[in-house]
């Protein structure tokens, strides 16, 4: 009888020990299985989960625009006053709804190439007005002409055309015209076959971004989605030195197993440069734990504050000998047009940049850029890309529309907020397929280990108690 009981207790302890050992073994084995599955599923090739979502994003992406409506155009043109602006928006478009095209796998160098078609559909229900709403904005052609043609002879010629076309420093344009293009009356008088259509994003619809060539991760998962080349080149030819490099991914995904200590590098064709994000916080996105990576202020700092940025300072006059910060001259990437990119409302920009503009209210929460990355897969499940488009306008003695200006202005035209969040259905699917399975495996591991240890300890204590009782 005593033997049966003791044997039972020993058996219980053994079973507990086995369960605990099995739970313990399951931890590295399970992790290995998860890693193997993740590695298989994030590869960019036909049949994987990643590939399906990569070809055509399952996320609805919106691009909201706020236009800076100039309140005192005549005063600025005549007296070189501060520019008073009032933002109007949002005007929302659906973007990135088109699948990648010309997808070609290269099995030799383990890359996949593609182009990303551009398209934008206006969403009236998510907008404060229509595409026909009018705004007073800087005359893009008049501001750019003397910057492109710094030759005084040609400026006299251009002045004749500006006067003839009755153009001035500011103009009134509809949202549709401003964003997607309008026939400029001044440029239309140039007697040579030049493009006379002007728009902040012209041309956009029916164009493509790329060709991108990215690593598919088949041979090395830590390189998955990293851009190997853009438009057939490994460099951009816009910046000197290492600033010209194409680093990281396109920000839609990153190599898996993202750690908080990692700096996420990505290339954005919108800003004609590679940039980076650092860990900000852990958040819960529809039940999925994600890491929020944010663009740090020092990404936009002057070389004085961040020496790594020295090669992004390509001109010395407007930048006050590279001491100004928070604006990026991307003219080289925009056919020499005086286009400057910044964060909305000149967030993280030096006071000299925003001083000539009234009506700006920078706000970290509203105007910063972030990426919410699921750390196991490296997928970006939510993002907000915020940037502002500005045009430099300088005094030009030979151009009557600009001759009264006493200083250069970096004039805000608009700012945009491009956002995407994983849909509820997709989030559920993601939880079921990825985080759910990992959670379940973790729970099984912990349960086995816990139950095993408890059983082993309980049965061993019972066995020992029994033994000492029998001994007495």
């Amino acid at each position: 009888m005593g033997c049966d009981r003791n044997c039972g207790l020993i058996a219980g302890a053994v079973i507990g020990a086995v369960l605990a050992v099995f739970g313990g073994i399951l931890m590295p084995v399970g992790d290995m299985l998860i890693e193997k599955t993740i590695k298989r599923e994030v590869v960019l090739e036909e049949g994987t989960t990643a590939f399906k979502n990569w070809v055509k994003t399952g996320t609805t992406v919106y691009r909201q625009f706020w236009i800076f409506d100039v309140q005192n155009p005549d005063d600025v043109a005549k007296n070189s006053s501060k520019i008073k602006v009032k933002q109007r928006g949002p005007y929302t478009y659906r973007v990135r709804y088109l699948a990648k095209e010309n997808i070609t796998q290269d099995p030799e160098d383990h890359t996949v190439s593609f182009v990303q078609p551009n398209g934008a559909i206006f969403e009236p229900s998510l907008s404060v007005g229509t595409e026909d709403d009018n705004f007073t904005v800087l005359n893009l052609a008049v501001a750019a002409a003397p910057h492109i043609y710094q030759n005084s002879f040609v400026q006299v010629v251009l002045n004749s055309l500006i006067k003839k076309s009755k153009s001035s420093m500011f103009q009134t344009r509809s949202l549709k015209e401003l964003l997607w293009g309008y026939k400029d009356p001044f440029l239309s008088l140039v007697p040579y076959p030049i493009s006379t259509t002007v728009g902040v994003f012209y041309p956009y619809n029916d164009t493509v971004d790329g060709v991108y060539k990215v690593f598919n991760g088949k041979d090395n998962i830590s390189k998955v989605a990293i851009i190997e080349s853009y438009k057939g080149k490994r460099n951009l030819s816009y910046w000197p030195s290492y600033c010209d490099m194409i680093n990281g991914t396109d920000a839609a995904s990153f190599p898996p197993f993202v750690e908080k200590s990692r700096t996420l590098r990505f290339f954005s064709s919108d800003i004609c440069r590679s940039i980076y994000a650092v860990f900000g916080s852990e958040i819960d996105l529809k039940g999925i734990p994600v890491y929020r990576f944010v663009l740090p202020a020092n990404a936009f700092a002057s070389p004085l504050q961040n020496p790594d940025n020295h090669c992004f300072c390509t001109e010395k006059v407007i930048s006050n000998n590279c001491t100004s910060y928070g604006v990026l001259d991307i003219g080289k990437c925009k056919e020499g047009k005086p286009v400057y990119i910044s964060l909305p409302h000149f967030l993280h920009a030096s006071p000299d940049v925003s001083e000539p503009i009234e009506g700006l209210h920078p706000n970290e929460d509203e105007h910063r850029t972030y990426l919410d990355v699921e750390p196991i897969t490296g997928f970006t499940l939510q993002f907000a890309k915020r940037l502002q488009v500005n045009i430099l306008v300088k005094p030009a003695r030979k151009i009557e529309a600009l001759k009264n200006l006493k200083r250069p202005y970096i004039v805000p035209i608009l700012w945009l907020n491009e956002t995407g969040t994983i849909g509820d259905e997709k989030a559920e699917m993601f939880k079921t397929q990825v985080t759910g399975k990992i959670k379940l495996l973790g729970m099984v591991e912990m349960a086995l280990l816990g139950i095993g240890v408890v059983m082993f300890v309980a049965f061993m204590i019972s066995y020992c108690a029994c033994k000492s009782k029998n001994g007495k």
Partner: antibody, heavy 117, light 107 residues
């Protein structure tokens, strides 16, 4: 086809006047503007006067300022150079030329102006 | 006014020779320089604009280089029809100014 034809040259006494014409075809002078360039016998080229597109501006070399006037009749697609108070040193072949960005892509055949007593 | 100084004022060369004519501006004119060819009794003909841009219909043996103040016209292999006078011109500032010319003669 773009063509420029000058006329109006000839012999004139010092202090006299002459009006040169430049008839353009194949393009509108209004859109481009017209220049007059002269070449004294055996010498180099000298830029004389310019009328900018749409008549928005006129410019003269110091040597002719106050004596020469450039104008255009857009209905006739013709440019003119009114030359007053002519001097012996104004003797030259006068060319009209088309330019937009400051280089001359089309030239007329030239008309000779001789200032002599 | 911007002075354009051409050198040499004349040169003798043979068919097939490589010929180089230089032009110096008295101040920076960026790349706003044109080159012309003129034959006796004829109007000048545009060869090059923006210092390096070959005008349509001009043979590729003609090329231009330079930026700022120093400019060069090169004829890679002189042909019989190339014997003429060559002028540089700055089209940066009014008054537009020409070099004094370089006469290319048969050796």
């Amino acid at each position: 086809e773009v063509q420029l034809v000058e006329s109006g040259g000839g012999l004139v006494q010092p202090g006299g006047s002459l009006r040169l014409s430049c008839a353009a075809s194949g393009f509108t002078i209004d859109a481009f503007g017209i220049h007059w360039v002269r070449q004294a016998p055996g010498k180099g080229l000298e830029w004389v006067a310019w009328i900018a597109p749409y008549g928005g501006y006129t410019y003269y070399a110091d040597s002719v300022k106050g004596r020469f006037t450039i104008s255009a009749d857009t209905s006739k697609n013709t440019a003119y150079l009114q030359m007053n108070s002519l001097r012996a040193e104004d003797t030259a072949v006068y060319y009209c030329a088309r330019s937009f960005f400051g280089y001359f892509d089309y030239w007329g055949q030239g008309t000779l102006v001789t200032v002599s007593s | 006014d911007i002075q354009m100084t051409q050198s040499p004022s004349s040169l003798s060369a043979s068919v097939g020779d490589r010929v180089t004519i230089t032009c110096r501006a008295s101040q920076d004119v960026s790349n706003w320089v044109a080159w012309y060819q003129q034959k006796p009794g004829k109007a000048p003909k545009l060869l090059i604009s923006y210092a390096t841009s070959l005008y349509s219909g001009v043979p590729s043996r003609f090329s231009g280089s330079g930026s700022g103040t120093d400019f060069t016209l090169t004829i890679s292999s002189l042909q019989p029809e190339d014997f003429a006078t060559y002028y540089c011109q700055q089209h940066s500032n009014a008054p537009l100014t020409f070099g004094q010319g370089t006469k290319v003669e048969i050796k």
